[in-house]
């Protein structure tokens, strides 16, 4: 399954929007810093086959979309930027979904992939637990925004590698 040529551009636009969404200086939130345990092993392994990579990427984007379409998220960010950001994510989800479904039909997604998807789910569970613990404070959201930028950047690197493999 070939992702559209525009997909990489969408990724960069998503990252740009997320950067613009910042409302407070990260330096004012140093006390709120947190290690969420991003499952980097699931994204930077040389053993990465294309089929599992796509379904893990789909899970990552889906979880980011879920996080930023909550009621609490709406209250934290500029409405226009948030709307654009979520629209970009939704487009990426559609692209990835088509590939995931195609690979499921030809039975390409190995069972091993269940581990990676679960690791991504647990990562987002830690993020939501943190936001709850911090009562969805502006600094907590800023910490999460910076964390999602990092994970999106890493996933973008994986997508570029996948494209080069094709």
């Amino acid at each position: 399954c070939d992702l559209p040529e525009t997909h990489s551009l969408d990724n960069r636009r998503t990252l740009m929007l997320l950067a613009q969404m910042s409302r407070i200086s990260p330096s004012s939130c140093l006390m709120d810093r947190h290690d969420f345990g991003f499952p980097q092993e699931e994204f930077d392994g040389n053993q990465f086959q294309k089929a599992p990579a796509i379904s893990v990427l789909h899970e990552l984007i889906q979880q980011i979309f879920n996080l930023f379409t909550t009621k609490d998220s709406s209250a934290a960010w500029d409405e226009d930027l948030l709307d654009k950001f979520c629209t970009e994510l939704y487009q990426q989800l559609n692209d990835l979904e088509a590939c995931v479904m195609q690979e499921e039909r030809v039975g390409e997604t190995p069972l091993m992939n269940a581990d990676s998807i679960l690791a991504v789910k647990k990562y987002f569970r830690r993020i939501t637990l943190y936001l709850t613990e911090k009562k969805y404070s502006p600094c907590a959201w800023e910490v999460v925004r910076a964390e999602i930028m990092r994970s999106l950047s890493l996933s973008t690197n994986l997508q570029e590698r996948l494209r080069r493999k094709e």
């Epitope: 947190h34 345990g37 092993e41 269940a114 679960l118 690791a119 830690r126």
Partner: antibody
């Protein structure tokens, strides 16, 4: 009865290699993440590595990354760790451990073997 | 990595005493803190998971409390068979990290 039985420990020279095995019984091995945890004689516990239920996710302690490799064979209910470039600091009892969930993190280590002793010495 | 600090490193108490062991983590681990008991010459055994969930078969004199960064293991009425080393461990992110251990002796 749920059981974990480690084997493969012994005396090895610095720079040498060793492969430990752990045979599981009494539970559905393929449904749980597994770990290796070590304990130097008279010292505390140190987590070494974890592998997801399907063998897809692998995590390592910084002290062993690049030297140790964890793997599993679900058809034979067996967990392995291949240990290379061993140093005297790797001398310890190595425990095979079952995790409470299918992949590492946000879990507990709810079942431990009796351990196998690895001695790295000249 | 998350640092886990346990105290005291050892304690001596009489049968029937109430004993508490403290565990602190360098960042919040929510409730993902586990406690283990290791008797001499044996492998560790899980006592309490997720800060306060007592494992099946573990006597009710053991209890755990806390969340975030501060946790406590309490033995309400110390028994001779409780002579062992106790370890806390964060299961929040890898690398999993353990406290240094607390050796409990019976006077």
């Amino acid at each position: 009865e749920m059981q974990l039985m480690e084997s493969g420990g012994g005396l090895v020279q610095p720079g040498g290699s060793l492969r430990l095995s752990c045979v599981a019984s009494g539970f559905t091995f393929k449904s749980f993440a597994m770990s290796w945890v070590r304990q130097a004689p008279g010292k505390g516990l140190e987590w070494v590595a974890s592998v997801g239920s399907q063998g897809g996710s692998k995590y390592y302690a910084p002290s062993v990354k690049g030297r140790f490799s964890i793997s599993r064979d679900n058809s034979n209910n067996t967990l392995y760790v291949q240990m290379n470039s061993l140093g005297v600091e790797d001398t310890a009892f190595y425990y095979c451990v079952k995790e409470t969930d299918a992949v590492a993190t946000m879990d507990a280590l709810d079942m431990w073997g009796q351990g196998t002793l690895v001695i790295v010495s000249t | 990595d998350i640092r886990v600090t346990q105290s005291p490193s050892s304690l001596s108490a009489s049968v029937g005493d109430r004993v508490s062991i403290s565990c602190q983590t360098s960042q919040s681990v929510n409730i993902y803190l586990n406690w283990y008991q290791q008797r001499p010459g044996k492998g560790p055994q899980l006592l309490i998971s997720a800060a306060s969930t007592l494992q099946s078969g573990v006597p009710s004199r053991f209890s755990g409390s806390g969340s975030g960064t501060d946790f406590i293991l309490t033995i309400i009425s110390l028994q001779p068979e409780d002579s062992a080393s106790y370890y806390c461990q964060q299961g929040y992110i890898t690398p999993y990290t353990f406290g240094q251990g607390t050796k409990v002796e019976i006077k």
